[in-house]
């Protein structure tokens, strides 16, 4: 009998609310044995994937989507999914990517610390690290 | 149908260098981790680096038995992943299998190519 | 690092037996336990992952168990052509690290 598949969730590290050429990763996590994970923007016609999976903790694996700068067409509505053999999972609640101009003056507010749909404790990283730092990473020019 | 092929084996002496090269096909090169295993003759498995996607840094782990003398790395504009060699020691000798990966086990797997170091 | 072992290292056995080979974590690996077959003179093949999904394709004989730091692989009705190497692996965490193998032969 196949097993019901839990919903992943998805956060944005550092935060929902970005400047303007900033950086930001979505980081989605599932159960134990994923094979793909997906990012869709707005709906599903369009989405990245990535077979590049870690061990988040014992019971979650998790995969990162990184936006090296961001733009103003990048705000909007993401989510994630998963395929753990045979079968997709249901989509995890939307986040909500907000984009700011960067004025940098004294009074414009600090970006939002990470904040998720779904746990919003991040399960710590195994004692070997699997997690790179965020740096250089994923354009994904195919989602937009 | 997912396809790898190692090149660039060869015998060497102790002390030298070669890199081998690894030709994939058949799926998403970028979005998937990848791996370089290796075998001594009559021996069991021996993982010996890894290589994660763009989307995470491109992060590098390797085996201790050959931190600092060997680099993984890829170019995912030509498919093709790649593993420098320096240093190389007689217990280096192996057939070299590069792997496509997800999580850290080996799904897909080249046919190998050997790597002799001898003097 | 994460060490595995592997019993037996060699086994006999006859077509249509049922073999059962076993891989010890010296930690806890949270079924981050994958298995290998390897033919003389070919690279390995994966079996399973996640210490009990089987792969596509590889016939339903084989399957996996185990949680924790004990894992146990079957061939419920061993065939000719399952005369190989098989090696366990573990993914939770690197260094990865594969069991010593176990030789299959025909009695």
């Known amino acids: 009998q196949e097993e019901d598949l839990p919903r992943p969730s998805i956060s944005a590290e550092p935060g929902t609310v970005i400047p303007l050429g900033s950086h930001v990763t979505f980081v989605c996590r599932g159960p134990v044995g994923v094979q793909t994970f997906r990012l869709e923007r707005d709906s599903r016609s369009t989405y990245n994937d990535t077979e590049d999976v870690s061990q988040a903790s014992p019971s979650e694996s998790e995969a990162r989507f990184r936006i090296d700068s961001v733009r103003e067409g990048n705000a909007g509505l993401y989510r994630c999914i998963y395929y753990k053999p045979p079968k997709w999972s249901e989509q995890s609640d939307y986040l909500e990517l907000l984009v700011k101009e960067s004025s940098g003056g004294p009074d414009s507010p600090d970006t939002e610390p990470g904040s998720s749909a779904g746990p919003t404790q991040r399960p710590s990283d195994n004692s070997h690290n699997e997690h790179a730092p965020a740096s250089q990473g994923l354009k994904a020019e195919h989602l937009y | 149908e997912v396809q790898l092929v190692e090149s660039g084996g060869g015998l060497v002496q102790p002390g030298g260098s070669l890199k081998l090269s690894c030709a994939a096909s058949?799926?998403?090169?970028?979005?998937?981790?990848m791996y370089w295993v290796r075998q001594a003759p009559g021996k069991g498995l021996e993982w010996v680096a890894r290589?994660?996607?763009?989307?995470?840094?491109?992060?590098?782990y390797y085996a201790d038995s050959v931190k600092g003398r060997f680099t993984i790395s890829r170019d995912d504009s030509k498919n093709t992943l790649y593993l420098q060699m320096n240093s190389l020691k007689t217990e280096d000798t192996a057939v070299y299998y590069c792997?496509?990966?997800?999580?850290?086990?080996?799904?897909?797997w080249g046919q190998g190519t050997l790597v002799t170091v001898s003097s | 690092d994460i060490q595995m072992t592997q019993s037996p290292s060699s086994l006999s056995a006859s077509v249509g037996d049922r073999v059962t080979i076993t891989c010890k974590a010296s930690?806890?690996?949270?079924?981050?336990l994958a298995w290998y077959q390897q033919k003389p003179g070919k690279a390995p093949r994966l079996l399973i992952s996640?210490?009990?999904s089987l792969e596509t394709g590889v016939p339903s004989r084989f399957s996996g168990s185990g949680s924790g730091t004990d894992y146990t692989f079957t061939i419920s009705s061993l065939q000719p052509e399952d005369i190989a190497t098989y090696y366990c692996?573990?993914?939770?965490?690197?260094?990865?690290?594969f069991g010593g193998g176990t030789r299959l032969e025909i009695k």
């Open positions: 792997v496509r990966g997800g999580s850290g086990f080996f799904a897909y």
């Open positions: 058949g799926f998403t090169f970028n979005t998937n981790a």
């Open positions: 290589i994660r996607s763009k989307s995470s840094n491109y992060a590098t």
């Open positions: 930690e806890d690996i949270y079924i981050r």
């Open positions: 996640t210490a009990t």
């Open positions: 692996q573990q993914y939770w965490s690197t260094p990865y690290t």
